[in-house]
Amino acid sequence: MMTGTIETTGNISAKKGGSVILQCHLSSTMAQVTQVNWEQHDHSLLAIRNAELGWHIYPAFKDRVAPGPGLGLTLQSLTMNDTGEYFCTYHTYPDGTYRGRIFLEVLESSVAEHSARFQIPIEGRDYKDDDDKHHHHHH
């Protein structure tokens, strides 16, 4: 049974050319996080944070995505095209998969960045990969 909830930075805005931190946090579960995937609105992957092996930043974003802080992601040199939805997908054992959503608006003006942290509904599915029980590292 999936008991966890994902907290995210919610709807955020940032200035063009600036940077922004995307953060998700899984709570209310003892499940072990084996991997976190970060995806963009068009479902292209930005980064992977594997609990055992560390970070992988996808080639298309290598020059403007930095890992962290924590399991989060820092987007740099923002453009107007970066406006849209971002998803964090937590692969956990034994619970399965949790997903969080963040909406980023990139602004031309110098409107101050804000970050409204709130809980969002989660999507879950059973995770049947038995080998994942060997992923005992949890960072």
Epitope: G54, P59, H135
Partner: antibody, heavy 121, light 107 residues
Framework: EVQLVESGGDLVKPGGSLRLSCAAS????????MSWVRQAPGKGLEWVGR??????????DYAAPVKGSFTISRDDSKNTLYLQMSSLKTEDTAVYYC????????????WGRGTLVTVSS | SYDLTQPPSVSVSPGQTASITCSGD??????ACWYQQKPGQSPVLVIY???KRPSGIPERFSGSNSGNTATLTISGTQAMDEADYYC?????????FGGGTKLTVLG
């Protein structure tokens, strides 16, 4: 110690089929993206295809010359990677290597010793 | 299909710097890897993700990748560096090798 051991290479006639295996040990196999790379005698390296980890969909990608005739699969419970080859041609003759894709700093740069596939009548 | 172009051969004197180039359309948008292969042996990864060195690879090996060109640089080249070198363009959907460059260490 990370080890990749390929097996299944053989002499096969054109049009035939063959399945190669790669037994992995020394790391959590389910985490890794795995590729097959081949090298024809006296020639350069040629990427055949890859399979991603289940946490990244477990999807496969193939090089154009083998698309439709080669299939990559994995069994994470057995720590084994497979390459099913059908409709083999003489130009498929090569040493086939099993490779861990260079995603992560901790687990990168590992190749097997290769297994020889000879397609000849 | 995506193509990578390498010079077939490069020669260098011992102790000098060898540079091997690899060219491909918008190669800088992908990760470049470099492999060293000696006769009868499996390839060895010497540079990955453009400029990272795997553990055990000497510091004299370095890499860069921008625009349409990736470069492998071997400073203070030694006789043991004589080998074939292959570049590879790597992204989340494909991986393509260059044709290979034979590095000859003179003398």
């Amino acid at each position: 110690e990370v080890q990749l051991v390929e097996s299944g290479g053989d002499l096969v006639k054109p049009g035939g089929s063959l399945r190669l295996s790669c037994a992995a040990s020394g790391f959590t196999f389910s985490n890794a993206w795995m590729s097959w790379v081949r090298q024809a005698p006296g020639k350069g390296l040629e990427w055949v295809g890859r399979i991603k980890s289940k946490a990244n969909g477990g999807t496969t990608d193939y090089a154009a010359p083998v698309k439709g005739s080669f299939t990559i699969s994995r069994d994470d419970s057995k720590n084994t990677l497979y390459l099913q080859m059908s409709s083999l041609k003489t130009e498929d003759t090569a040493v086939y290597y099993c490779v861990i894709d260079p995603l992560y700093d901790i687990l990168t740069g590992y190749w097997g010793r290769g297994t020889l596939v000879t397609v000849s009548s | 299909s995506y193509d990578l172009t390498q010079p077939p051969s490069v020669s260098v004197s011992p102790g000098q710097t060898a540079s091997i180039t690899c060219s491909g359309d918008k190669l800088g948008d992908k990760y470049a890897c470099w492999y060293q292969q000696k006769p009868g042996q499996s390839p060895v990864l010497v540079i990955y993700q453009d400029s990272k060195r795997p553990s055990g690879i000497p510091e004299r090996f370095s890499g860069s990748n921008s625009g349409n060109t990736a470069t492998l640089t071997i400073s203070g080249t030694q006789a043991m560096d004589e080998a074939d070198y292959y570049c590879q363009a790597w992204d989340s959907s494909t991986a393509v090798f260059g044709g290979g460059t034979k590095l000859t260490v003179l003398g």
